[in-house]
């Protein structure tokens, strides 16, 4: 046969699928790696054809497309399950050929069991939204497709096991949900079933978004430095250990990059030849506020190390600070002076 | 120094119309979620409704719903309550209140009483 | 909604001693329990929220504690001026819900 253009396995595509449940997976060919789309290449007399390996086994096999009730079919570039079933998990081929020319991706595809309260190893797309924030909506996820728009789904949105009904500041509208004044205890797992008809069949959709409230814009701030700070001196005497924290509070600033750094002496540390060691650590707030803590230690402090200026940095995407920390060495009777 | 003073309160009959206004100084309004809490005479006090900072989010307790609407003009620095079909039992003392998710309602008006009586 | 249940209704305290009122929630509101005085004829003023944090301007003789559904209030020497009804409200939920209060009187 002849040589046909191997995209290999496309793993950035893990597609997840819920069992007993319809699923349309398009070929990534046309997505993602050709510059064409299905309607170009259909026309030009190219042909594309799927393929599967099931889930631990290295056979490739031609899909079986005459089965009970068309149960997997394809259509133009979507295969189709109507529904899935458990032993579908494998990884799936998409060929595009002719007499004269091929191209070929594969890609993992995994059915998923859920259980009764929607309890899945499904990963779940995050919604994250600002808090106090007037209305936020969120829209059952990829039903598209699925359906012709002259069917009406009935749809049901549920918060983790609860059909949502009453729910004080979350309103169900349709294929909508909106949340009206967030608080953190919105946070959670919002699931929307979609149930239409087809053939005389009804199928089911199952969709979870996470829903994560976090701070608001309007509340964002530069980095503030709770230590070091003026109040504190570090007093030591050589041959001692030196210990710093800075502590950094960043208020939660959406795809911020939050940043914290020593200087000694306006130099990096790995920039000066003091033996240090510096340990991060980072912790969150419910509505994912970030304290960063940069702990600098230097094991056995000489009288150098005692007149060195050490500053905290900081910076997000509202602005920069910085801080100096007061060390001394004992007994001197003076601090350095912390000029920046 | 924040500063929330209500007015529009007074007597009115039973299905009746009222609006109260907050006229808000001190702090930056627009920044604020606002809301408004009653207490009936010699009662507790009693959520009434709630507006999200930028005006678009509303909320309201179930005895008062389809009945009163919240609002606000952040270039005003005013919050309102649009008081509509009012019973006996909205007879209170409606103060306005700023909130904050972290501190609740951290400074309150002196309040303005609503009396629904025929 | 979130019940949020005070006690006692009335407490008798003398000036000095220490004053312990407690607040249940029918289910966890978390740390996001608020605490207020109100005198009579005066609006509400905040106290406590986070159910521990003082307000700005409260003395430090005031204090909050406890997390999920109980919560307390003390007040550790009752000045002439504490003399006033105390409720506790919840802000995890909507809708926001008071405690029907709480009088603390001279005994």
């Known amino acids: 046969s002849e040589r046909c253009d191997d995209w290999g396995l496309d793993t950035m595509r893990q597609i997840q699928v819920f069992e007993d449940e319809p699923a349309r997976i398009k070929c990534p060919l046309f997505e993602h790696f050709l510059k064409y789309n299905y309607s170009t290449a259909h026309s030009s007399g190219l042909t594309l054809i799927w393929y599967w390996t099931r889930q631990d086994r290295d056979l490739e096999e031609p899909i079986n497309f005459r089965l009970p009730e068309n149960r997997i079919s394809k259509e133009k570039d979507v295969l189709w399950f109507r529904p899935t079933l458990l032993n579908d998990t494998g990884n799936y081929t998409c060929m595009l050929r002719n007499t004269t020319y091929c191209s070929k991706v594969a890609f993992p595809l995994e059915v998923v069991q859920k259980d009764s309260c929607f309890n899945s190893a499904m990963r779940f797309p995050v919604h994250k939204m600002y808090i106090e924030h007037g209305i936020h909506k969120i829209t059952c996820p990829n039903v598209d497709g699925y359906f012709p728009s002259s069917v009406k789904p009935s749809v049901t949105w549920y918060k983790g096991c609860t059909e949502i009904v009453d729910f004080h500041n979350v309103l169900p509208e349709g294929m909508n949900l909106s949340f009206f004044i967030p608080l953190v205890s919105n946070n959670g797992n919002y699931t929307c079933v979609v149930t239409y008809p087809e053939n005389g069949r009804l199928f089911h959709l199952t969709r979870t978004v996470t829903v994560k409230v976090v701070g608001s814009p309007k509340d964002a701030l530069p980095p503030q430095i709770y230590s070091p700070n003026d109040r504190v001196v570090y007093e030591k005497e050589p041959g001692e250990e030196l210990v710093i924290p800075c502590k950094v509070y960043f208020s939660f600033i959406m795809d911020s990059h939050n940043e914290v750094w020593w200087t000694i002496d306006g130099k990096k540390p790995d920039d000066v030849t003091v033996d240090i060691t510096i340990n991060e650590s980072v912790s969150y707030s419910s509505t994912e506020d970030e304290t960063r803590t940069q702990i600098l230690s230097i094991k056995k402090v000489t009288p150098e190390d005692l007149r060195r200026n050490y500053v905290c940095h900081a910076r997000n995407t509202k602005g920069e600070a910085e801080q100096a920390a007061k060390v001394k060495q004992k007994g001197n009777g003076c601090t350095e002076p912390m000029t920046l | 120094e924040v500063q929330l003073l209500e007015s529009g309160g007074g007597l009115v009959q039973p299905g009746g119309s009222l609006r109260l206004s907050c006229a808000a100084s001190?702090?930056?309004?627009?920044?604020?979620?606002m809301g408004w809490v009653r207490q009936a005479p010699g009662k507790g006090l009693e959520w009434v409704s709630a507006?999200?900072?930028?005006?678009?989010?509303?909320l309201y307790a179930d005895s008062v719903k389809g009945r009163f609407t919240i609002s606000r003009d952040n270039s005003k620095n005013t919050l309102y309550l649009q008081m509509n079909s009012l019973r006996a039992e909205d007879t209170a003392v409606y103060y306005c209140?700023?909130?904050?998710?972290?501190?609740?309602?951290?400074?309150w008006g002196q309040g303005t009483l609503v009396t629904v009586s025929s | 909604e979130i019940v949020m249940t005070q006690s006692p209704a009335t407490l008798s305290v003398s000036p000095g001693e220490r004053a312990t009122l407690s607040c249940r929630a029918s289910?966890?509101?978390?740390?996001?329990l608020a605490w207020y005085q109100q005198k009579p004829g005066q609006a509400p003023r905040l106290l406590i929220y986070g159910a521990s944090t003082r307000a700005t301007g409260i003395p430090a003789r005031f204090s909050g504690s406890g997390s999920g559904t109980e919560f307390t209030l003390t007040i550790s020497s009752l000045q002439s001026e504490d003399f006033a009804v105390y409720y506790c409200?919840?802000?995890?939920?909507?809708?926001?819900?008071f405690g029907q209060g709480t009088k603390v009187e001279i005994k």
């Open positions: 409200q919840q802000y995890n939920n909507w809708p926001w819900t």
């Open positions: 209140a700023r909130f904050h998710y972290r501190s609740a309602f951290d400074y």
């Open positions: 507006i999200s900072y930028d005006g678009e989010g509303t």
């Open positions: 001190g702090f930056t309004f627009r920044d604020y979620a």
């Open positions: 289910q966890s509101v978390s740390s996001n």
